[in-house]
C-alpha cells in the first residue's frame, strides 16, 4: 500500500478511509500542481487505471464512485495529465479498507490447566471483520469488585498470581474495531471449578495369551486432583465407530483397564479426564495404537457382548465419526449400559 507519499494535492474518501463492506464509496482527488492545468485527472486502484463512474467536478477536482465496494483492501492513487508532459503526474494516494463491525464474541470459555499457573480464556470471534480488531478481556472480582482488563487477539492467558484476591469472577470480552464494538455474554467463573487435570497419557498396552485373550491398557496422569472421572474411547483403525468406557480414576497409581477385543486387529485408544462433577474436559490424549494377538481358539469375540471388565467400568457406549475427515467430531449412536446408568450427556463434545 501507500504508506508515505509526497502529495501535490489531496485525496479523501467518503464515508472514510475505513468503511463498512458493501457501502457506496466516493473518492475525491484534488490537484495542487504548479505549472499544470490538467487536461484529465485519472484514478488507479491497485495500480490499474479506472475507466468508469469518474466525474470531473471542477478544474482541480475529480471524483470516482464505487457502488457496493466489497474489497477488504485497496490502494488508490490519482494522477494528472499535464499539457507538455509525456508522463502522468502523481497527485496523491490513499490506502482504503472495508470490513465489518465485530460480532459479539461467543462461546467464552475459561479454564486453568493444572500446573500451568494461568487461566486461559478462549472465544469465537464470529465472522471475519477484514480490518484490525482488538479484543478486551474484562475480569471482575465478584468479591472485591476490582476489575482487570487484558488486550488480546484471539485468546488470553491470565496469570493466576493476578487472581489471588478472590475465587469468583465475572469474565466478558469486548470486540472493538473502528466500525463498532460488541460485548460477549458474561461468564461466571469460580477458579476451583475450571481446573482441568494434568494430561492423561496411555503408556502401554498388552494382550494376554489366555483362552479368552484380554487387552490391558495402562494409563497415567501427574494430576494432584483426587476425584477424577475419565473416558477411554477405542476402535479398530478400519472402523468409524468408537466405543467409550467411563472410569472413576485415582492416579496415585497407574490405571489398568481391561478389554476383550477382536483378535488380530489394530486398535486405537484415547483417554480424557475431568475433575469429577466439573464440566471441563481434557482434550483427548494422543492416539495409542495397539495390535491384538492372533486368534488361538475358534470363538469370534464381539466387543459389545463380551463379559466386560473386572475394573470398575461404568458405561460403554458407541459413537461414530461424522466423516473420515473429522475423526474428532462425534455423534452419539447408542449406549450399552453395564453399571445401571446411561452414558454421560457429554458425548457431543468429544473432540
Amino acid at each position: 500500500g501507500i504508506t508515505s507519499i509526497n502529495c501535490s494535492g489531496d485525496m479523501w474518501v467518503e464515508p472514510g478511509e475505513i468503511f463498512q463492506m458493501g457501502m457506496n464509496v466516493s473518492i475525491y482527488c484534488q490537484e495542487a500542481l504548479k505549472h499544470c492545468r490538467p487536461r484529465n485527472l485519472y484514478f488507479y486502484k491497485n495500480g490499474f487505471k479506472e475507466e468508469f463512474d469518474i466525474t470531473r467536478i471542477n478544474r482541480t477536482t475529480a471524483r470516482i464512485w464505487y457502488k457496493g465496494f466489497s474489497e477488504p483492501h485497496a490502494y488508490m492513487h490519482c494522477t494528472a495529465e499535464c499539457p507538455g508532459h509525456f508522463q502522468e503526474t502523481l497527485i496523491c494516494g490513499k490506502d482504503i479498507s472495508s470490513g465489518h463491525p465485530p460480532d459479539a464474541p461467543s462461546n467464552l470459555t475459561c479454564v486453568i490447566y493444572e500446573y500451568s499457573g494461568n487461566m486461559t480464556c478462549t472465544w469465537n470471534t464470529g465472522k471475519p471483520t477484514y480490518i484490525d480488531t482488538k479484543y478486551i478481556v474484562h475480569v471482575k472480582s465478584l468479591e472485591t469488585e476490582e476489575e482487570q482488563q487484558y488486550l488480546a487477539s484471539s485468546y488470553v492467558k491470565i496469570s493466576t498470581d493476578s487472581l489471588q484476591g478472590s475465587r469468583k469472577y465475572l469474565v466478558w470480552v469486548q470486540a472493538v474495531n473502528s466500525l463498532g464494538m460488541e460485548n460477549s455474554q458474561q461468564l461466571h467463573v469460580h477458579l476451583d471449578d475450571i481446573v482441568i487435570p494434568s494430561a492423561s497419557i496411555i503408556s502401554r498396552a498388552e494382550t494376554t495369551n489366555d483362552t479368552v485373550p484380554k487387552t490391558i491398557v495402562y494409563w497415567k496422569s501427574k494430576t494432584m486432583i483426587e476425584k477424577v472421572f475419565c473416558e477411554m474411547r477405542y476402535k479398530t483403525t478400519t472402523n468409524q465407530t468408537w466405543s467409550v468406557k467411563e472410569f472413576d480414576a485415582n492416579f496415585t497409581y497407574v490405571q489398568q483397564s481391561e478389554f476383550y477385543l477382536e483378535p488380530d486387529s489394530k486398535y486405537v485408544f484415547q483417554v480424557r479426564c475431568q475433575e469429577t462433577g466439573k464440566r471441563n474436559w481434557q482434550p483427548w490424549s494422543s492416539p495409542f495404537v495397539h495390535q491384538t494377538s492372533q486368534e488361538t481358539g475358534k470363538r469370534n469375540w464381539q466387543p459389545w457382548s463380551s463379559p466386560f471388565v473386572h475394573q470398575t467400568s461404568q458405561t460403554v457406549s458407541q459413537v461414530t465419526a461424522k466423516s473420515s475427515h473429522e475423526p474428532q467430531k462425534m455423534e452419539m449412536l447408542s449406549a450399552t449400559i453395564f453399571r445401571g446408568h446411561p452414558a454421560s450427556g457429554n458425548h457431543q463434545d468429544i473432540g
Epitope: E17, I18, D95, S97, I131, D132, T133, K134, I136, Q148, Q149, Y150, L151, A152, S153, V156, K157, S162, V176, N177, S178
Partner: nanobody, 116 residues
C-alpha cells in the same frame, strides 16, 4: 513498565470544549494500544476511544463526531479533543495502555464536569 499521567480536565458549560492529554513514560510505550476510558459515579468504566491501528480509531457511539483522538509520538503523548460537551459526559477520564496478553495500565485519571 509504562506510567501514564492525564491532565486537562475541569468544569465546563454544556456545549463547551476540553482537551485532555495523557503523557506516557517508560520503555514499553511504543507497544501500547492507547485508549481513553471514562467512569461516571456508580457506573462501570467504559471505553470512549481507542487507537486500533494506524489510521483507524474506535469511538463509542455516544461521542462519535464530537470527540477526536490524536497522538504525538515525539512527545509520547495522546490527546482527546472533546467538543460539544454534554452533562452526560461528566466522569473521571482515564487513559490506558494495553499490550497483548498483559494487564492494562491506567493513569490516575482527570475529572471532567459538564454543567447545564
Amino acid at each position: 513498565q509504562v506510567q501514564l499521567q492525564e491532565s486537562g480536565g475541569g468544569s465546563v458549560q454544556a456545549g463547551g470544549s476540553l482537551r485532555l492529554s495523557c503523557a506516557a513514560s517508560g520503555y514499553t510505550y511504543s507497544s501500547c494500544t492507547m485508549g481513553w476510558y471514562r467512569q461516571a459515579p456508580g457506573k462501570e468504566r467504559e471505553l470512549v476511544s481507542m487507537l486500533i491501528s494506524d489510521g483507524s480509531t474506535f469511538y463509542a457511539d455516544s461521542v462519535k463526531g464530537r470527540f477526536t483522538f490524536s497522538q504525538e509520538n515525539a512527545k509520547n503523548t495522546v490527546y482527546l479533543q472533546m467538543n460539544s460537551l454534554k452533562p452526560e459526559d461528566t466522569a473521571m477520564y482515564y487513559c490506558g495502555c494495553a499490550t497483548l496478553g498483559s494487564r492494562t495500565v491506567w493513569g490516575q485519571g482527570t475529572q471532567v464536569t459538564v454543567s447545564s
